[in-house]
Interface confidence: low
Amino acid sequence: FNISGCSTKKLLWTYSTRSEEEFVLFCDLPEPQKSHFCHRNRLSPKQVPEHLPFMGSNDLSDVQWYQQPSNGDPLEDIRKSYPHIIQDKCTLHFLTPGVNNSGSYICRPKMIKSPYDVACCVKMILEVKPQTNASCEYSASHKQDLLLGSTGSISCPSLSCQSDAQSPAVTWYKNGKLLSVERSNRIVVDEVYDYHQGTYVCDYTQSDTVSSWTVRAVVQVRTIVGDTKLKPDILDPVEDTLEVELGKPLTISCKARFGFERVFNPVIKWYIKDSDLEWEVSVPEAKSIKSTLKDEIIERNIILEKVTQRDLRRKFVCFVQNSIGNTTQSVQLKEKRG
């Protein structure tokens, strides 16, 4: 097909030779076509399109990608010729960097349903080059981690050496969707949640006297938490003796703080020591009374419906455990005098 009518976009991928890096191209069809029909602007309000639109705003998966060989050969179907490039809906993923990725990439709808659809295509001229030694040594990584529950930021690798004042306007995408409010070289995340994870793309325009290019970088963002290095601590009971009245009901609460663990299997239980006997007690279920992203306070009560003489000779032991270790706190009941 004739690609002369395709809109053209120039992109620059400057890759680091020190790290693994990915790159993406979006099928950036002109906005009217992207959002509804390629030929919608040619219809009067009362006209009805003869055919269904080739692409709706919510479904950009029916596109075909081609590469235009530099020697003028016919267009090549990406899927057949380039195993290191994969298509995911309207996005083309480059799994490995290299200058051999330079070239012209064309995307268009798979189904051409009307003469107008022929011009519904975009040509992306991609230039790929390694970062020079003169480039910023401490540029942001293409793999960035955000700590859950804390403040974090996502930096645009190709601009991370520039101050905010020097930085050009940046266009950010997350998982292929435009983040219209983000315009600087750094996205500040006030509080990190798991939904902040994903593939972020930052674009900015670089111009010279002849032409302008979109400089693009891709950042894989992972939301993580640091596993606790501490065993749980018992917040309550604090004292090892408790004054009680015989024949009265009694609830002893065990509250323990567990640091965050990705694989979280907290243990909180009561057992009784009576002479040389020791047995675990069937008590109400443990309940979480406070949960943050960093830790969790869990409570489990032991209920004595009546305190007996026998109970005064027992030790009531709260046992808590995580993957690091365990802690215990024992309570001896003492009859209240007077």
Epitope: P249, I303, E305, R310
Partner: antibody, heavy 122, light 111 residues
């Protein structure tokens, strides 16, 4: 006067169900004691059936043979104890007593109802 | 579950006799034991709780003793109104509720 009065005893066929009630007067079904059901088959001894704690937890306890078939419950607003009996068998024929224990010194039953007779027979 | 074994299952006695009924627990229940008296067609009545404490309104001729596994109910001088069936009961409770098991009963009849 502090007393317990059972009702609901009847002749029922094997496999049938019955709900016994026990109305309390002179005290509230909300305190530091157990309210229980004890039964006595004709000419036999006393057999503990189930207890419910009258405190806020409302913990329930059952004799091993009663678990799954019998359910003890209370309605504090009506000051009434219940025993729901399902899948009744001939051996469940007995006088069912509603009892309340002593607030201290062990779970000894200081207060007994007059009993209600349940007969399971075809 | 704890088992309570009462003996004898029946005994014949005369008014004025000293009567002793024993109850054995299958495990140590300390002093968590009660004794009841039941007359035909009536509900049982608490006589003794915590092995040796006399319930309210119970005549002093009734007494209880023992702890651990072996318990005794003694009627120092049998009265006509004492001819009845007597039951012991484990009244132990704690964190794990112990079923309130009764002994098999001892029937005291006139000789």
């Amino acid at each position: 006067e502090v007393q317990l009065e059972e009702s609901g005893g009847d002749l029922v066929q094997p496999g049938g169900s019955l709900r016994l009630s026990c109305a309390a007067s002179g005290f509230s079904f909300n305190g530091n004691y157990y309210i229980c059901w004890v039964r006595q088959a004709p000419g036999k001894g006393l057999e503990w059936v189930a207890c419910i704690y009258a405190g806020s937890s409302g913990s329930t306890y059952y004799a091993s043979w009663a678990k799954g078939r019998f359910t003890i419950s209370r309605d504090t607003s009506k000051n009434t104890l219940y025993l729901q009996m399902n899948s009744l068998r001939a051996e469940d024929t007995a006088v069912y007593f509603c009892v309340r224990d002593k607030p201290a010194g062990g779970s000894s039953y200081t207060l007994w109802g007059q009993g209600t007779l349940v007969t399971v027979s075809s | 579950d704890i088992q309570m074994t009462q003996s004898p299952s029946s005994l014949s006695a005369s008014v004025g006799d000293r009567v002793t009924i024993t109850c054995q627990a299958s495990e140590d229940i300390e002093s968590y034991l009660a004794w009841y008296q039941q007359k035909p067609g009536q509900a049982p009545k608490l006589l003794i709780y915590q092995a040796s404490k006399l319930a309210s309104g119970v005549p002093s001729r009734f007494s209880g003793s023992g702890s651990g596994t072996d318990f005794t109910l003694t009627i120092s001088s049998l009265q006509p109104e004492d001819f009845a069936t007597y039951y012991c009961q484990c009244t132990l409770y704690g964190v794990n509720f112990v079923p309130n098991v009764f002994g098999g009963g001892t029937k005291v009849v006139i000789k």
